[in-house]
């Protein structure tokens, strides 16, 4: 009685279990009931990444400098290259198959978290207490002057943009 | 390259034994079924057995069954076939060739056998 | 056993002109598991042709396969000098046995 379905790492093909071949190599010819499944290695620039009956292996993905990648991490026959962005740059999507530059957080937002070359900058308003003067990528909001601790008074105050401005304390007359 | 050779062909009387070898070369030989195909001097191809890549299973054509046997060692990359009570019918070259799903692809050049008295 | 019946026994041609090859089977050939193979004299045969259609590596594309079930056809769409020979057809899908057809003598005309 012929199959009907296979088991783990095999496959069907006329009516006979052929074993899949490993990762790293592609199919030659399927298995008959006398040979044994033909598989070959993947060449230097490919690669296949599962069990599986391809007849060609994958390309290992290019990291194109034109676009602002480079390489995180060298394909082997198993795995495909990784790419990742160049300073001051992340990735467009979750493939990354392009780049753009980081985001600056604008006066009144601080960086919440830094870039990376998968991530963009994530940035945060400025709570109570806190400002940024400046359009910029890696700076967090910083707290207002204590002006106490200088033996200070706030002349003016501070926003989500601008730090309090401290002035001597009034002396009172006798 | 990848490359089948036969031997142990010769003249040989009626009703005696002959063993033939096929050795491989150029590919791994222990994930390949082997087989036998004979050609009589001036006739067609004709099939004599298979024997699979482990040696467990093995069929014969009915002209040869019960006298010749087929085996292989993988340990030497080489294929056999023990022809016993030979016969001038068994008079004709012997192919080794490889078994994939896509035919026979890798033949030997052949080795000729003569059964006379 | 599945009986593979060849024509024409001979077939005188020209180099250049088109040879078409049949080989018949008595039953139903199972996934198109028919091979070609082309003998020179004194040489092994030589695999052209698997799965009825499919060209060997290595074999010339002026050779081609067709046919399924129990009809199939061998064409050379341009005889050269070294296409003249014996071509044989094989089933491998019902065994044992293993059959070849009596084969088809391609001669120079």
């Known amino acids: 009685e012929p199959p009907t379905a296979c088991r783990e790492k095999q496959y069907l093909i006329n009516s006979q279990c052929c074993s899949l071949c490993q990762p790293g190599q592609k199919l030659v010819s399927d298995c008959t009931e006398f040979t044994e499944t033909e598989c070959l290695p993947c060449s230097e620039s490919e690669f296949l990444d599962t069990w599986n009956r391809e007849t060609r292996c994958h390309q290992h993905k290019y990291c194109d400098p034109n676009l602002g990648l480079q390489v995180q991490q060298k394909g082997t026959s198993e795995t495909d290259t990784i790419c990742t962005c160049e300073e001051g740059l992340h990735c467009t999507s979750e493939s990354c198959e392009s780049c753009v530059p980081h985001r600056s957080c604008l006066p009144g937002f601080g960086v919440k978290q830094i870039a990376t070359g998968v991530s963009d900058t994530i940035c945060e308003p400025c709570p109570v207490g806190f400002f940024s003067n400046v359009s910029s990528a890696f700076e967090k909001c910083r707290p207002w002057t204590s002006c106490e601790t200088k033996d200070l008074v706030v002349q003016q105050a501070g926003t989500n943009k601008t730090d309090v401005v401290c002035g001597p304390q009034d002396r009172q007359r006798a | 390259q990848v490359q089948l050779v036969e031997s142990g062909g010769g003249v040989v009387q009626p009703g005696r034994s002959l063993r033939l070898s096929c050795a491989a070369s150029?590919?791994?030989?222990?994930?390949?079924?082997m087989h036998w195909v004979r050609q009589a001097p001036g006739k067609g191809l004709e099939w004599v057995a298979v024997?699979?890549?482990?040696?467990?299973?093995?069929y014969y054509a009915e002209s040869v069954k019960g006298r010749f046997t087929i085996s292989r060692d993988n340990s030497k990359n080489t294929l056999y076939l023990q022809m016993n009570s030979l016969r001038a019918e068994d008079t004709a070259v012997y192919y080794c060739?490889?078994?994939?799903?896509?035919?026979?692809?890798?033949w030997g050049q052949g080795t000729m056998v003569t059964v006379s008295s | 056993e599945i009986v593979l019946t060849q024509s024409p026994g001979t077939l005188s041609l020209s180099p250049g002109e088109r040879a078409t090859l049949s080989c018949r089977a008595s039953?139903?050939?199972?996934?198109?598991?028919l091979a070609w193979y082309q003998q020179k004299p004194g040489q092994a045969p030589r695999l052209l042709i698997y799965?009825?259609?499919s060209l060997a590596t290595g074999i010339p594309d002026r050779f081609s396969g067709s046919g399924s079930g129990t009809d199939f056809t061998l064409t050379i769409s341009r005889l050269e000098p070294e296409d003249f020979a014996v071509y044989y057809c094989?089933?491998?899908?019902?065994?044992?046995?293993?059959?070849f057809g009596g084969g088809t003598k391609v001669e120079i005309k």
């Open positions: 094989q089933q491998y899908s019902d065994y044992p046995p293993f059959t």
């Open positions: 150029g590919f791994t030989f222990e994930k390949y079924g």
């Open positions: 799965g009825a259609s």
């Open positions: 060739a490889r078994d994939t799903s896509r035919g026979h692809d890798i």
């Open positions: 024997i699979s890549y482990e040696g467990t299973k093995k």
């Open positions: 039953q139903s050939v199972s996934y198109s598991y």
